[in-house]
Protein backbone atom coordinates (compact mmCIF):
# COMPACT_ATOMS: atom_id res chain seq x y z
CA UNK A 1 0.00 0.00 0.00
CA UNK A 2 1.47 3.37 -0.99
CA UNK A 3 0.16 6.51 0.73
CA UNK A 4 1.71 9.96 0.42
CA UNK A 5 4.87 8.41 -0.98
CA UNK A 6 5.41 6.15 2.04
CA UNK A 7 5.27 2.37 1.71
CA UNK A 8 3.21 0.88 4.53
CA UNK A 9 4.05 -2.76 5.32
CA UNK A 10 0.99 -4.94 4.75
CA UNK A 11 -0.11 -7.50 7.31
CA UNK A 12 -0.55 -10.76 5.38
CA UNK A 13 -3.66 -11.41 7.49
CA UNK A 14 -5.47 -8.35 6.12
CA UNK A 15 -8.61 -9.11 4.12
CA UNK A 16 -8.43 -8.41 0.40
CA UNK A 17 -10.49 -5.32 -0.39
CA UNK A 18 -10.81 -6.51 -4.02
CA UNK A 19 -12.64 -9.62 -2.87
CA UNK A 20 -16.36 -9.57 -3.78
CA UNK A 21 -17.14 -10.68 -0.23
CA UNK A 22 -15.23 -7.75 1.28
CA UNK A 23 -17.78 -5.67 3.26
CA UNK A 24 -18.55 -2.19 1.92
CA UNK A 25 -20.07 -1.22 5.27
CA UNK A 26 -18.84 -1.49 8.82
CA UNK A 27 -20.48 -1.66 12.23
CA UNK A 28 -19.63 1.29 14.48
CA UNK A 29 -20.30 1.44 18.22
CA UNK A 30 -21.54 4.98 18.88
CA UNK A 31 -21.16 4.68 22.64
CA UNK A 32 -18.37 7.16 23.36
CA UNK A 33 -15.67 5.68 25.57
CA UNK A 34 -14.82 8.93 27.42
CA UNK A 35 -18.29 10.51 27.48
CA UNK A 36 -17.53 12.21 30.82
CA UNK A 37 -15.09 14.57 29.09
CA UNK A 38 -16.58 18.06 29.01
CA UNK A 39 -17.70 18.72 25.43
CA UNK A 40 -18.60 22.37 25.89
CA UNK A 41 -15.41 24.31 25.09
CA UNK A 42 -16.75 27.36 26.94
CA UNK A 43 -16.55 25.43 30.18
CA UNK A 44 -13.26 23.62 29.57
CA UNK A 45 -11.19 26.81 29.16
CA UNK A 46 -11.65 30.53 28.73
CA UNK A 47 -9.07 30.97 25.98
CA UNK A 48 -11.85 32.21 23.70
CA UNK A 49 -12.11 35.32 25.93
CA UNK A 50 -8.47 35.72 26.97
CA UNK A 51 -6.89 35.34 23.54
CA UNK A 52 -5.45 38.34 21.69
CA UNK A 53 -7.71 37.12 18.88
CA UNK A 54 -10.86 36.28 20.89
CA UNK A 55 -13.68 34.29 19.36
CA UNK A 56 -17.33 33.49 19.91
CA UNK A 57 -18.37 29.85 20.18
CA UNK A 58 -21.50 28.71 18.39
CA UNK A 59 -23.30 25.44 18.86
CA UNK A 60 -23.70 23.88 15.42
CA UNK A 61 -26.40 21.23 15.70
CA UNK A 62 -27.31 18.82 12.91
CA UNK A 63 -29.44 15.77 13.76
CA UNK A 64 -28.39 14.15 10.47
CA UNK A 65 -24.76 14.10 11.59
CA UNK A 66 -22.78 12.23 14.25
CA UNK A 67 -21.69 13.91 16.40
CA UNK A 68 -24.82 16.05 16.13
CA UNK A 69 -23.28 18.98 18.07
CA UNK A 70 -20.04 20.65 17.00
CA UNK A 71 -18.86 23.93 18.50
CA UNK A 72 -17.70 26.44 15.85
CA UNK A 73 -15.44 29.42 16.54
CA UNK A 74 -16.00 32.77 14.87
CA UNK A 75 -13.41 35.51 15.38
CA UNK A 76 -14.78 38.56 17.15
CA UNK A 77 -12.57 41.17 15.58
CA UNK A 78 -10.91 42.03 12.32
CA UNK A 79 -7.79 43.00 14.27
CA UNK A 80 -6.16 41.66 17.44
CA UNK A 81 -6.27 42.89 21.02
CA UNK A 82 -3.15 44.80 22.04
CA UNK A 83 -1.62 45.24 25.50
CA UNK A 84 -3.94 48.18 26.22
CA UNK A 85 -7.01 46.08 25.50
CA UNK A 86 -7.74 47.90 22.24
CA UNK A 87 -8.15 46.35 18.79
CA UNK A 88 -4.99 46.71 16.71
CA UNK A 89 -5.69 46.55 12.97
CA UNK A 90 -2.02 46.09 12.07
CA UNK A 91 -2.74 42.42 12.80
CA UNK A 92 -5.59 40.10 11.78
CA UNK A 93 -7.64 37.62 13.79
CA UNK A 94 -8.13 34.50 11.69
CA UNK A 95 -9.79 31.15 12.42
CA UNK A 96 -7.76 27.98 13.00
CA UNK A 97 -9.46 25.37 10.86
CA UNK A 98 -9.29 21.62 11.24
CA UNK A 99 -10.60 18.97 8.90
CA UNK A 100 -12.47 16.29 10.82
CA UNK A 101 -14.37 13.12 9.99
CA UNK A 102 -18.05 12.88 10.89
CA UNK A 103 -20.80 10.39 10.13
CA UNK A 104 -23.76 11.61 8.06
CA UNK A 105 -27.05 9.72 8.07
CA UNK A 106 -27.58 8.16 4.66
CA UNK A 107 -30.27 7.88 3.51
CA UNK A 108 -31.40 10.95 5.51
CA UNK A 109 -33.37 10.33 8.74
CA UNK A 110 -32.20 6.71 8.97
CA UNK A 111 -31.21 5.97 12.57
CA UNK A 112 -28.52 3.34 11.95
CA UNK A 113 -27.06 4.07 8.52
CA UNK A 114 -24.20 6.54 8.08
CA UNK A 115 -21.68 7.69 5.49
CA UNK A 116 -18.22 9.00 6.42
CA UNK A 117 -17.80 12.69 5.58
CA UNK A 118 -14.97 15.22 5.89
CA UNK A 119 -15.88 18.66 7.23
CA UNK A 120 -13.89 21.77 8.05
CA UNK A 121 -14.43 23.24 11.50
CA UNK A 122 -13.05 26.40 13.10
CA UNK A 123 -11.71 25.50 16.52
CA UNK A 124 -10.42 28.90 17.61
CA UNK A 125 -8.74 32.04 16.31
CA UNK A 126 -5.15 33.20 16.16
CA UNK A 127 -3.41 36.47 15.43
CA UNK A 128 -1.46 36.84 12.17
CA UNK A 129 0.27 39.57 10.22
CA UNK A 130 -2.06 40.70 7.43
CA UNK A 131 -1.35 40.09 3.77
CA UNK A 132 -0.54 43.50 2.31
CA UNK A 133 -1.42 44.08 -1.35
CA UNK A 134 0.62 46.90 -2.88
CA UNK A 135 -1.28 48.90 -5.49
CA UNK A 136 0.83 50.12 -8.39
Amino acid sequence: IVKAGITIPRNPGCPNSEDKNFPRTVMVNLNIHNRNTNTNPKRSSDYYNRSTSPWNLHRNEDPERYPSVIWEAKCRHLGCINADGNVDYHMNSVPIQQEILVLRREPPHCPNSFRLEKILVSVGCTCVTPIVHHVA
Epitope: N60, E72, K74, L78, G79, V87, L120, S122, I131
Partner: antibody, heavy 124, light 111 residues
Protein backbone atom coordinates in the same frame (compact mmCIF):
# COMPACT_ATOMS: atom_id res chain seq x y z
CA UNK B 1 -32.35 59.84 16.01
CA UNK B 2 -29.52 57.88 14.40
CA UNK B 3 -29.05 59.17 10.87
CA UNK B 4 -26.68 59.03 7.89
CA UNK B 5 -27.01 61.56 5.08
CA UNK B 6 -25.01 61.18 1.86
CA UNK B 7 -24.20 64.00 -0.54
CA UNK B 8 -21.86 64.79 -3.42
CA UNK B 9 -23.29 62.58 -6.14
CA UNK B 10 -23.87 63.80 -9.67
CA UNK B 11 -22.98 63.42 -13.33
CA UNK B 12 -19.29 63.11 -14.18
CA UNK B 13 -17.36 62.20 -17.32
CA UNK B 14 -15.28 59.00 -17.57
CA UNK B 15 -11.86 59.61 -16.06
CA UNK B 16 -13.26 62.32 -13.80
CA UNK B 17 -13.39 62.62 -10.03
CA UNK B 18 -16.06 63.04 -7.40
CA UNK B 19 -16.06 63.24 -3.61
CA UNK B 20 -18.95 61.80 -1.65
CA UNK B 21 -19.72 62.79 1.94
CA UNK B 22 -21.81 61.12 4.61
CA UNK B 23 -22.87 63.19 7.61
CA UNK B 24 -23.58 61.10 10.72
CA UNK B 25 -25.75 62.16 13.65
CA UNK B 26 -27.41 60.66 16.72
CA UNK B 27 -24.52 58.36 17.75
CA UNK B 28 -20.84 58.46 18.73
CA UNK B 29 -19.42 58.33 15.21
CA UNK B 30 -15.81 57.76 16.35
CA UNK B 31 -16.67 54.35 17.86
CA UNK B 32 -18.01 52.70 14.73
CA UNK B 33 -16.72 50.98 11.61
CA UNK B 34 -18.18 52.65 8.53
CA UNK B 35 -18.82 51.32 5.03
CA UNK B 36 -19.60 52.42 1.50
CA UNK B 37 -21.86 50.09 -0.46
CA UNK B 38 -23.11 50.72 -4.00
CA UNK B 39 -25.92 49.48 -6.21
CA UNK B 40 -25.79 49.78 -9.99
CA UNK B 41 -29.15 50.36 -11.74
CA UNK B 42 -31.22 47.15 -11.62
CA UNK B 43 -28.37 45.25 -9.92
CA UNK B 44 -27.54 43.94 -6.44
CA UNK B 45 -25.59 45.40 -3.56
CA UNK B 46 -21.81 45.62 -3.86
CA UNK B 47 -19.45 46.43 -1.02
CA UNK B 48 -17.01 49.22 -1.97
CA UNK B 49 -14.91 50.12 1.05
CA UNK B 50 -14.64 50.12 4.85
CA UNK B 51 -12.77 52.11 7.46
CA UNK B 52 -11.93 51.35 11.11
CA UNK B 53 -13.21 53.69 13.86
CA UNK B 54 -9.94 55.61 14.19
CA UNK B 55 -9.56 55.95 10.42
CA UNK B 56 -6.14 54.32 10.54
CA UNK B 57 -6.98 51.28 8.42
CA UNK B 58 -9.01 50.98 5.25
CA UNK B 59 -10.30 48.11 3.09
CA UNK B 60 -11.36 48.12 -0.57
CA UNK B 61 -13.09 45.95 -3.12
CA UNK B 62 -10.77 44.88 -5.95
CA UNK B 63 -12.95 46.77 -8.43
CA UNK B 64 -12.09 50.16 -6.85
CA UNK B 65 -8.65 49.54 -5.35
CA UNK B 66 -6.17 52.25 -6.35
CA UNK B 67 -8.94 54.56 -7.63
CA UNK B 68 -11.14 55.21 -4.56
CA UNK B 69 -10.08 56.43 -1.12
CA UNK B 70 -12.21 56.19 2.00
CA UNK B 71 -11.54 58.56 4.89
CA UNK B 72 -13.29 60.03 7.90
CA UNK B 73 -13.17 63.13 10.06
CA UNK B 74 -14.32 62.10 13.52
CA UNK B 75 -14.36 65.71 14.72
CA UNK B 76 -16.93 66.51 12.01
CA UNK B 77 -18.80 63.17 12.24
CA UNK B 78 -18.31 62.74 8.50
CA UNK B 79 -17.33 59.87 6.22
CA UNK B 80 -15.86 60.50 2.76
CA UNK B 81 -15.28 58.59 -0.46
CA UNK B 82 -12.88 60.19 -2.94
CA UNK B 83 -13.48 58.62 -6.36
CA UNK B 84 -10.89 59.14 -9.10
CA UNK B 85 -10.49 57.71 -12.63
CA UNK B 86 -14.22 57.05 -12.75
CA UNK B 87 -15.61 54.52 -15.24
CA UNK B 88 -19.07 53.89 -16.66
CA UNK B 89 -19.33 50.78 -14.47
CA UNK B 90 -19.04 52.97 -11.35
CA UNK B 91 -22.50 54.37 -12.11
CA UNK B 92 -24.62 53.48 -9.07
CA UNK B 93 -26.42 54.65 -5.98
CA UNK B 94 -23.80 54.93 -3.23
CA UNK B 95 -24.87 54.20 0.34
CA UNK B 96 -22.92 54.84 3.49
CA UNK B 97 -23.63 52.40 6.31
CA UNK B 98 -22.67 51.88 9.94
CA UNK B 99 -21.43 48.62 11.44
CA UNK B 100 -23.64 47.10 14.10
CA UNK B 101 -22.31 47.61 17.65
CA UNK B 102 -20.66 48.62 20.04
CA UNK B 103 -20.63 47.24 22.75
CA UNK B 104 -20.08 44.09 20.68
CA UNK B 105 -19.08 46.44 17.91
CA UNK B 106 -17.05 44.69 15.33
CA UNK B 107 -16.74 44.32 11.62
CA UNK B 108 -18.69 41.11 11.53
CA UNK B 109 -22.18 41.82 12.82
CA UNK B 110 -23.66 43.53 9.78
CA UNK B 111 -24.70 47.08 8.87
CA UNK B 112 -27.56 48.33 11.01
CA UNK B 113 -27.93 51.93 9.82
CA UNK B 114 -27.95 53.03 6.17
CA UNK B 115 -28.20 56.40 4.48
CA UNK B 116 -30.74 57.10 1.74
CA UNK B 117 -28.02 56.97 -0.95
CA UNK B 118 -26.58 59.41 -3.44
CA UNK B 119 -26.56 58.79 -7.20
CA UNK B 120 -23.33 58.83 -9.19
CA UNK B 121 -23.62 58.76 -12.99
CA UNK B 122 -20.47 58.35 -15.10
CA UNK B 123 -21.21 59.18 -18.71
CA UNK B 124 -19.85 61.21 -21.57
CA UNK C 1 -12.38 34.32 -1.86
CA UNK C 2 -15.78 32.66 -1.91
CA UNK C 3 -19.14 33.62 -3.43
CA UNK C 4 -22.67 33.66 -2.03
CA UNK C 5 -25.36 32.35 -4.38
CA UNK C 6 -29.06 33.07 -3.97
CA UNK C 7 -32.06 32.10 -6.09
CA UNK C 8 -33.01 34.92 -8.44
CA UNK C 9 -36.64 34.92 -7.31
CA UNK C 10 -39.14 33.13 -5.07
CA UNK C 11 -42.88 33.55 -4.73
CA UNK C 12 -45.50 32.44 -2.25
CA UNK C 13 -49.04 33.28 -1.14
CA UNK C 14 -49.93 35.47 1.85
CA UNK C 15 -49.99 33.56 5.14
CA UNK C 16 -47.60 30.87 3.88
CA UNK C 17 -43.94 30.31 4.75
CA UNK C 18 -41.07 30.96 2.36
CA UNK C 19 -37.37 30.12 2.67
CA UNK C 20 -34.59 31.92 0.78
CA UNK C 21 -31.25 30.12 0.54
CA UNK C 22 -27.72 31.52 0.35
CA UNK C 23 -25.07 28.97 -0.63
CA UNK C 24 -21.38 29.52 0.03
CA UNK C 25 -19.11 28.39 -2.82
CA UNK C 26 -16.05 27.38 -0.76
CA UNK C 27 -15.08 27.14 2.88
CA UNK C 28 -17.59 26.43 5.62
CA UNK C 29 -20.78 28.49 5.97
CA UNK C 30 -20.28 28.18 9.74
CA UNK C 31 -16.89 29.95 9.68
CA UNK C 32 -18.30 33.46 9.31
CA UNK C 33 -21.46 35.20 10.42
CA UNK C 34 -24.23 35.67 7.87
CA UNK C 35 -26.47 38.73 7.71
CA UNK C 36 -29.72 39.26 5.79
CA UNK C 37 -30.99 42.56 4.39
CA UNK C 38 -34.36 43.54 2.97
CA UNK C 39 -34.60 46.23 0.31
CA UNK C 40 -37.90 47.59 -0.94
CA UNK C 41 -37.96 49.39 -4.31
CA UNK C 42 -36.52 52.91 -4.08
CA UNK C 43 -35.38 52.47 -0.47
CA UNK C 44 -32.14 51.72 1.33
CA UNK C 45 -31.54 48.20 2.66
CA UNK C 46 -32.40 47.35 6.26
CA UNK C 47 -30.92 44.53 8.32
CA UNK C 48 -33.40 41.79 9.26
CA UNK C 49 -31.01 39.09 10.55
CA UNK C 50 -27.47 39.39 11.93
CA UNK C 51 -25.06 36.83 13.41
CA UNK C 52 -26.72 33.98 11.46
CA UNK C 53 -29.97 33.96 13.41
CA UNK C 54 -30.31 37.11 15.54
CA UNK C 55 -33.19 39.50 14.94
CA UNK C 56 -32.71 43.26 15.48
CA UNK C 57 -35.33 44.96 17.61
CA UNK C 58 -38.28 46.01 15.49
CA UNK C 59 -38.02 43.03 13.13
CA UNK C 60 -41.01 40.70 13.66
CA UNK C 61 -40.42 37.15 14.87
CA UNK C 62 -41.87 35.90 11.57
CA UNK C 63 -38.29 36.36 10.29
CA UNK C 64 -35.72 33.74 11.25
CA UNK C 65 -32.23 32.82 10.08
CA UNK C 66 -30.32 29.55 10.17
CA UNK C 67 -27.26 27.85 8.74
CA UNK C 68 -26.97 24.31 7.43
CA UNK C 69 -23.50 22.82 7.18
CA UNK C 70 -24.63 19.82 5.12
CA UNK C 71 -25.73 22.07 2.25
CA UNK C 72 -23.15 24.76 3.18
CA UNK C 73 -25.87 27.37 3.06
CA UNK C 74 -27.69 29.95 5.16
CA UNK C 75 -31.44 30.41 5.02
CA UNK C 76 -33.88 33.21 5.72
CA UNK C 77 -37.36 31.95 6.58
CA UNK C 78 -40.38 34.24 6.61
CA UNK C 79 -43.57 32.77 8.04
CA UNK C 80 -47.08 34.20 7.88
CA UNK C 81 -46.20 36.08 4.69
CA UNK C 82 -47.65 39.57 4.26
CA UNK C 83 -47.82 41.66 1.10
CA UNK C 84 -45.44 44.17 2.76
CA UNK C 85 -42.74 41.44 2.82
CA UNK C 86 -42.44 41.78 -0.96
CA UNK C 87 -38.90 43.06 -1.54
CA UNK C 88 -35.38 42.07 -2.56
CA UNK C 89 -33.48 40.08 0.07
CA UNK C 90 -29.67 39.91 0.25
CA UNK C 91 -27.45 37.66 2.30
CA UNK C 92 -24.04 38.95 3.30
CA UNK C 93 -20.89 37.70 4.95
CA UNK C 94 -17.17 38.55 4.96
CA UNK C 95 -13.72 37.10 4.90
CA UNK C 96 -11.05 37.63 7.51
CA UNK C 97 -9.05 40.04 5.35
CA UNK C 98 -11.81 42.64 5.61
CA UNK C 99 -13.71 41.93 2.39
CA UNK C 100 -17.50 42.10 2.71
CA UNK C 101 -19.54 39.89 0.37
CA UNK C 102 -23.15 40.10 -0.75
CA UNK C 103 -25.27 37.47 -2.45
CA UNK C 104 -26.84 38.41 -5.77
CA UNK C 105 -30.21 39.06 -4.15
CA UNK C 106 -33.57 37.29 -4.26
CA UNK C 107 -36.77 38.96 -5.38
CA UNK C 108 -39.63 37.82 -3.13
CA UNK C 109 -43.08 38.09 -4.66
CA UNK C 110 -46.13 37.69 -2.44
CA UNK C 111 -48.83 36.43 -4.81
Amino acid sequence: EVQLLESGGGLVQPGGSLRLSCAASGFTFSKYFMFWVRQAPGKGLEWVSSIVPSGGHTYYADSVKGRFTISRDNSKNTLYLQMNSLRAEDTAVYYCARAKGPPRGSYYYGMDVWGQGTTVTVSS
Amino acid sequence: QYELTQPHSVSESPGKTVTISCTRSSGSIASNYVQWYRQRPGSAPIIVIYEDNQRPSGVPDRFSGSIDTSSNSASLTISGLKTEDEADYYCSSYDYSGTVLFGGGTKLTVL
